[in-house]
Interface confidence: low
């Protein structure tokens, strides 16, 4: 006869490990007892359990409550045992010794491998601002046994670098994603993907990128200069910009206070029926936590009685 077992039994942390040991004998042969021991190199054998055909299962004190026989029905030639709730410390070499009648004793070894699935964490880098050089966007760390694989899934262009720290029974892998921040990256997902043989599927953690920026400011409303004449109603100037965080707007007049009746409504400056008093230089000031921009325009209200052309200047400054 001969023993059937596995070279390696792989189990995920916390699961039950079946340690197989089956005697395939000739007709009429019987198994008297099966002794299980842990036999790691450099250490003496440590008994796990003794499985006796007549007296049943006896578990050594060190493994009390953790070693059981597989559920019925049981084959009398099957000396397999279950090791409950596998922990990392269980990883190692195990031996089953089978005493048979009349063929004698047989022994076989297997290696128990305990997979420790990682619990990944993602840490965003410093605040991203347009104009920075290559900057850390996020780092992702996962520790497990064996070492997990950490990669990135994103449409954003960047560079990655990884490092690994080995511990006695596991390894921690950290991957960093560096990029050159630009406004087009705003709202883009950056996903850390962790693969490991102890995971049924890859673990994914997504970080949404936020890049601070402020676009140049410009003023709309003066495109048709002939509309800016005395008596016109509904005249308005609109300040155009965009930014992250969203900017706030402030209107001032460079050559004095805003005329009475002029309404400020966020990015829009609304005028009452135009008079020559509304002529002047108006400044839109756009700001967010990242930066500020100014754009100024010169309004020259035409008097239809006069046949003089109107000048309109647009100046943008940051």
């Amino acid at each position: 006869g001969e023993l059937e077992t596995s070279d390696v039994v792989t189990v995920v942390l916390g699961q039950d490990a079946k340690l197989p040991c089956f005697y395939r004998g000739d007709s009429g042969e019987q198994v008297g007892q099966v002794a299980w021991a842990r036999v790691d190199a450099g250490e003496g054998a440590q008994e796990l359990a003794l499985l006796h055909s007549k007296y049943g299962l006896h578990v050594s004190p060190a493994y009390e409550g953790r070693v059981e026989q597989p559920p019925p029905p049981r084959n009398p030639l099957d000396g397999s045992v279950l090791l409950r709730n596998a922990v990392q410390a269980d990883e190692g070499e195990y031996e089953c010794r089978v005493s048979t009648f009349p063929a004698g004793s047989f022994q076989a070894r297997l290696r128990l491998r305990v997979l420790v699935p990682p619990l990944p964490s993602l840490n965003p880098g410093p605040a991203l601002e347009e104009g920075q050089g290559l900057t850390l966007a996020a780092s992702c760390t996962a520790e497990g046994s064996p070492a997990p694989s950490v990669t990135w899934d994103t449409e954003v262009k960047g560079t990655t670098s990884s490092r690994s720290f080995k511990h006695s029974r596991s390894a921690a892998v950290t991957s960093e994603f560096h990029l050159v921040p630009s406004r087009s990256m705003n709202g883009q997902p950056l996903t850390c993907v962790v693969s490991h043989p102890g995971l049924l599927q890859d673990q994914r953690i997504t970080h949404i990128l936020h890049v601070s920026f402020l676009a140049e400011a410009s003023v709309r409303g003066l495109e048709d200069q002939n509309l800016w004449h005395i008596g016109r109603e509904g005249a308005m100037l609109k300040c155009l910009s965009e930014g992250q965080p969203p900017p706030s707007y402030n209107w001032t007049r460079l050559d004095g206070p805003l005329p009475s009746g002029v309404r400020v409504d966020g990015d829009t400056l609304g005028f009452p029926p135009l008079t020559t008093e509304h002529s002047g230089i108006y400044v839109c000031h756009v700001s967010n936590e990242f930066s500020s921009r100014d754009s100024q325009v010169t309004v020259d209200v035409l008097d239809p009685q006069e046949d003089s052309g109107k000048q309109v200047d647009l100046v943008s400054a940051s």
Epitope: N123, G125, P126, Q132, G133, L134, T135, L136, T159, S161, S162, R163, S164, F165, T174, E176
Partner: antibody
Framework: EVQLVESGGGLVQPGGSLRLSCAAS???????MSWVRQAPGKGLEWVSR???????DYADSVKGRFTISRDNSKNTLYLQMNSLRAEDTAVYYC???????????????WGQGTLVTVSS | DIQMTQSPSSLSASVGDRVTITCRAS??????LAWYQQKPGKAPKLLIY???SLQSGVPSRFSGSGSGTDFTLTISSLQPEDFATYYC?????????FGQGTKVEIK
């Protein structure tokens, strides 16, 4: 063990050019490489870095005047310095980013440095 | 750019003394900090990476600690060969920046 040897330093007039070389024994081209300089009696200042794909970063003080490059076949790193100024006077070191852990950009191997003097 | 400020700028100590050098970043840099030693006429030498990890071949009397903005390099028992200038460097974001240096002299 990696060894880095810089050359190409010397005396140059303001506005002039120099090309520094950094020859490596041992393979450096699966790593990032940097130039760091040190003005006489002063501290260390990072100048430029080149990545494995050939892309690069520069300090604001040298942007537009200096160009970093690498020749993988010769295992050599270069720094082309144009429009040199008196304040560029320094010992220039080439240095390798730590290879085995890729932890950010600390520098584990440095050359002995080459002196660049910009003076009329 | 992130500013790195070392203190003190110089110190005098005797062989066997415990020496502490601090480095402060103008913004949080996690553990992205390295310490270097430089002797006159020589290139800098990496002592500590990742704020607290000892570079291979560096004596265990050197240690680093800290995270965020405040970091410390400690020499537990100063030896004759430790008299040099020490620099911290952040590599959290580009450009990497160095502290101004701390010169350790013989008392």
């Amino acid at each position: 063990e990696v060894q880095l040897v810089e050359s190409g330093g010397g005396l140059v007039q303001p506005g002039g050019s120099l090309r520094l070389s950094c020859a490596a024994s041992g393979d450096i081209f699966d790593t990032y490489m940097s130039w760091v300089r040190q003005a006489p009696g002063k501290g260390l200042e990072w100048v430029s870095r080149i990545y494995t794909d050939g892309s690069s970063d520069y300090a604001d003080s040298v942007k537009g005047r200096f160009t970093i490059s690498r020749d993988n076949s010769k295992n050599t790193l270069y720094l082309q310095m144009n429009s040199l100024r008196a304040e560029d006077t320094a010992v220039y070191y080439c240095a390798r980013q730590t290879e085995d852990r890729s932890y950010g950009y600390d520098l584990d191997y440095w050359g002995q440095g080459t002196l660049v003097t910009v003076s009329s | 750019d992130i500013q790195m400020t070392q203190s003190p700028s110089s110190l005098s100590a005797s062989v066997g003394d415990r020496v502490t050098i601090t480095c402060r970043a103008s913004q949080g840099i996690s553990s992205y900090l390295a310490w270097y030693q430089q002797k006159p006429g020589k290139a800098p030498k990496l002592l500590i990476y990742a704020a607290s990890s000892l570079q291979s071949g560096v004596p265990s009397r050197f240690s680093g600690s800290g995270s965020g903005t405040d970091f410390t390099l400690t020499i537990s028992s100063l030896q004759p060969e430790d008299f040099a200038t020490y620099y911290c460097q952040q590599h959290y974001t580009t450009p990497p920046t160095f502290g101004q240096g701390t010169k350790v002299e013989i008392k």
